[in-house]
Amino acid sequence: SGTTNTVAAYNLTWKSTNFKTILEWEPKPVNQVYTVQISTKSGDWKSKCFYTTDTECDLTDEIVKDVKQTYLARVFSYPAGNVESTGSAGEPLYENSPEFTPYLETNLGQPTIQSFEQVGTKVNVTVEDERTLVRRNNTFLSLRDVFGKDLIYTLYYWKSSSSGKKTAKTNTNEFLIDVDKGENYCFSVQAVIPSRTVNRKSTDSPVECMGQEKGEFREI
């Protein structure tokens, strides 16, 4: 139902990485505009992206208030230039999104190797602790602050001269691994939340190799 010149939004999809969260939908509007509302299961609806011709709405500011809550959004369709007009039932057309729980579902962004340092036959590899848009006491929290020990990093490391990748894991942002003296190694890291069933892993970090500028070598 609804007025003849509006269509309901469809394919509502959450796109979220490191809690930066955007709701996307279709279709591209023709003679209509959209408004988005978001709410927790028990909360009130809050309107965002008023009368927009976009087919996406950044809801980060709302979901970061409590990333462990489950959110629902809905997209209202209005005739362009006549936003007071409603559907035949007296309400504007709208479509509900799937439920979204940021803590369980946000994609893990690609990690970055911040540095590595060799001391004798040990190498310390440090992963950058990425800042998120989640705030506590007016400061932005890092990924580690938000996930704590739920977040694991897997390090893949290999001799530059071979293909086999050894692995190491940490629930901090640092690895200390044994290496063969006189060999150059390459490194890549992956963020993992093992307790999840979906979106468990990030993409791999860019590969960093010894003998390049990120590293430091100290002979003991």
Epitope: I152, Y156, K165, A168, S188, Q190, V192, P194, R200, K201
Partner: antibody
Amino acid sequence: EVQLVESGGGLVQPGGSLRLSCAASGFTISSYIIHWVRQAPGKGPEWVGYIDPSNGYTYYADSVKGRFTISADTSKNTAYLQMNSLRAEDTAVYYCARDPQTLTSPFDYWGQGTLVTVSS
Amino acid sequence: DIQMTQSPSSLSASVGDRVTITCRASQDVNTAVAWYQQKPGKAPKLLIYSASFLYSGVPSRFSGSRSGTDFTLTISSLQPEDFATYYCQQHYTTPPTFGQGTKVEIK
């Protein structure tokens, strides 16, 4: 329900080849690491190698390096073990196992195994 | 590679007995040790992970502990279904390695 099912085992002559499959259901292999483990008759388990299907990274035991290759087809949710230049000492039951990539990564699910016999 | 030395290789016990199996790692493996139970013709089954954590669905008579590089699997009161072979495994470094196994037989 999480399940791993191996297939492709059988009798092969020394120097021959065989490809084992590990079909996964109840989870997506690209979200985990898949290991191959073998067990010779009357012996303990021996780790063969792993693959991370999300990036194709692999590592092999010295005893099989250069002869065995692990691969994965994420569209089929299946991992493979290609075994070439087989020797009598490769005779074993071959298992695939799932690694949840936790901090200490035990193998939480195993297949039922498939027997490979290398004999002339 | 890290060696996992398991002892004893076999033991005989009666239902209700307390059974202890040990594994010694050749170098530090932190708590990255698991214990598996295997019955003839079957795949190993995870019992204990991270040295002392009971895997889901495993009876509470099974427990694990760590002291440095020594790891212990204890069955507090042996049940008929516990007669099997037990293996330890480290996954601290690549390659993961297994102990040689302990066969628990009926006395």
